[in-house]
Amino acid sequence: AGVFELQIHSFGPGPGPGAPRSPCSARLPCRLFFRVCLKPGLSEEAAESPCALGAALSARGPVYTEQPGAPAPDLPLPDGLLQVPFRDAWPGTFSFIIETWREELGDQIGGPAWSLLARVAGRRRLAAGGPWARDIQRAGAWELRFSYRARCEPPAVGTACTRLCRPRSAPSRCGPGLRPCAPLEDECEAPLVCRAGCSPEHGFCEQPGECRCLEGWTGPLCTVPVSTSSCLSPRGPSSATTGCLVPGPGPCDGNPCANGGSCSETPRSFECTCPRGFYGLRCEVSGVTCADGPCFNGGLCVGGADPDSAYICHCPPGFQGSNCEKRVDRCSLQPCRNGGLCLDLGHALRCRCRAGFAGPRCEHDLDDCAGRACANGGTCVEGGGAHRCSCALGFGGRDCRERADPCAARPCAHGGRCYAHFSGLVCACAPGYMGARCEFPVHPDGASALPAAPPGLRPGDPQRYL
């Protein structure tokens, strides 16, 4: 047994451009809190798989109100560690999910509103009893800095918290077969605590709570001898004629204990040792109440005021499962364009784009302009899977390599005549019109419609469009 400890150092904008908007405002002050979820082994970090190693919620942080005009700073954090107790051995390799939640403190009907601000996930190797490990994770434009460690709860020691230590009974040395406990040299490694009732003569254990039998003995508690003589049937009553004692069906066969309970034989029947949150003869009853906070992801817990009444989690949009622990498959709507691969990271959807595409939804076609230059001062414009050049005046064609006839599009209005010019085109306007494209009528009184003709140009003069 032991405790995983998580210390959040900072949560704020990450480096680089695109600083995130502050999650709080003067109109909607808010505060942060964190949730950590641990899973054994290098398992997938999917939000919907249960936090088999445990989970914990932090306290709420101080109330934060954005200062208008100021850049989003590191946000004020809750005090203290997040602690996830583990009952069995520390697995050494684990996966984690750390969620940053925002609690808005405005005048919402029905109390404060929660929303997930960021989720980071990772897989790590960690020995119990080691020093604090530091980590930095980014989620979008946010950055989370934290440290973590796993420590054993006495009397457990070791990198997996499976060895047990006791104070020395004698000052000089430990008992037979027992070593000193490093780093606690004044303590001795203690025998493991096997399953309750495990035969001290015929059983042993390598992990706390188990009971493994020496050769010649069987049964959950290693109390049943196995005959090596002429017993033919592997199961059945004892045979008086052969002197065989063959165990009959045991009450723990097939493990009648539900929800991960462990079965122990008793003189009359069996007994289930239930994990936390379950009880009943076969651990079939959930003892979790709404006070235990069983609903994840902002789910609302209803009922379950006492261990005898069931609770129900009403999940917010986007979550499902009996504890709101499963995320709806938002990727099934296929939001990624151009063949991009959709990843649901919880706090956001991400698209992994195929080569040649970019953008949050792979909407930008990089191949349009990659390795292609537009000639004669043209600029490349992305779009639609085919590159397009916006050509400088006097040039046209796909790559701006062709000399364009600037008058081909008949740019001069109201019957104006177009002349190609080295720097573009010139319109000679018909009487009564003026402007670079002859677009402005000249009023009968000699005044022109806005904009006025530049000084030095009379209405009707050819005007060069620059």
Partner: nanobody, 120 residues
Framework: EVQLVESGGGEVQPGGSLRLSCAAS????????MGWYRQAPGKQRELVAG???????KYAESVKGRFTISRDNAKNTVYLQMSSLRAEDTAVYYC??????????????WGQGTLVTVKP
């Protein structure tokens, strides 16, 4: 903030028809993908029909030929025309949209759901 408002749910007999609509409003720059999910009691939420990010339509196998999704881009609205309804279509139908906000961020939004009940 973006709101998705569904309407059109109700009770209908097997073989009957219903038309659901979902209107998106708020600080929307563009709608990237939009569609309908449903969740029957005790079941996972599943996509029924939708317009994908590439603009194509997608249908669940169980509704092909019976349901038709359409949209009105000017009104930021999608519709689900449901015909030949069966008892197994009974569920809460949720509108969902992947939206590009005015801030240029993309966010995924859900409606509150509308109940469709098919029973004789």
């Amino acid at each position: 903030e973006v709101q998705l408002v569904e309407s059109g749910g109700g009770e209908v007999q097997p073989g009957g028809s219903l038309r659901l609509s979902c209107a998106a409003s708020g600080s929307i720059f563009s709608i990237n993908a939009m569609g309908w999910y449903r969740q029957a009691p005790g079941k996972q939420r599943e996509l029924v029909a939708g317009f994908t990010g590439d603009g194509s339509t997608k249908y669940a196998e169980s509704v092909k030929g019976r349901f038709t999704i359409s949209r009105d881009n000017a009104k930021n609205t999608v519709y689900l025309q449901m015909s030949s309804l069966r008892a197994e279509d009974t569920a809460v139908y949720y509108c969902a949209a992947d939206v590009q906000l005015l801030s240029s961020d993309y966010e995924f939004y859900w409606g509150q759901g509308t109940l469709v009940t098919v029973k004789p």
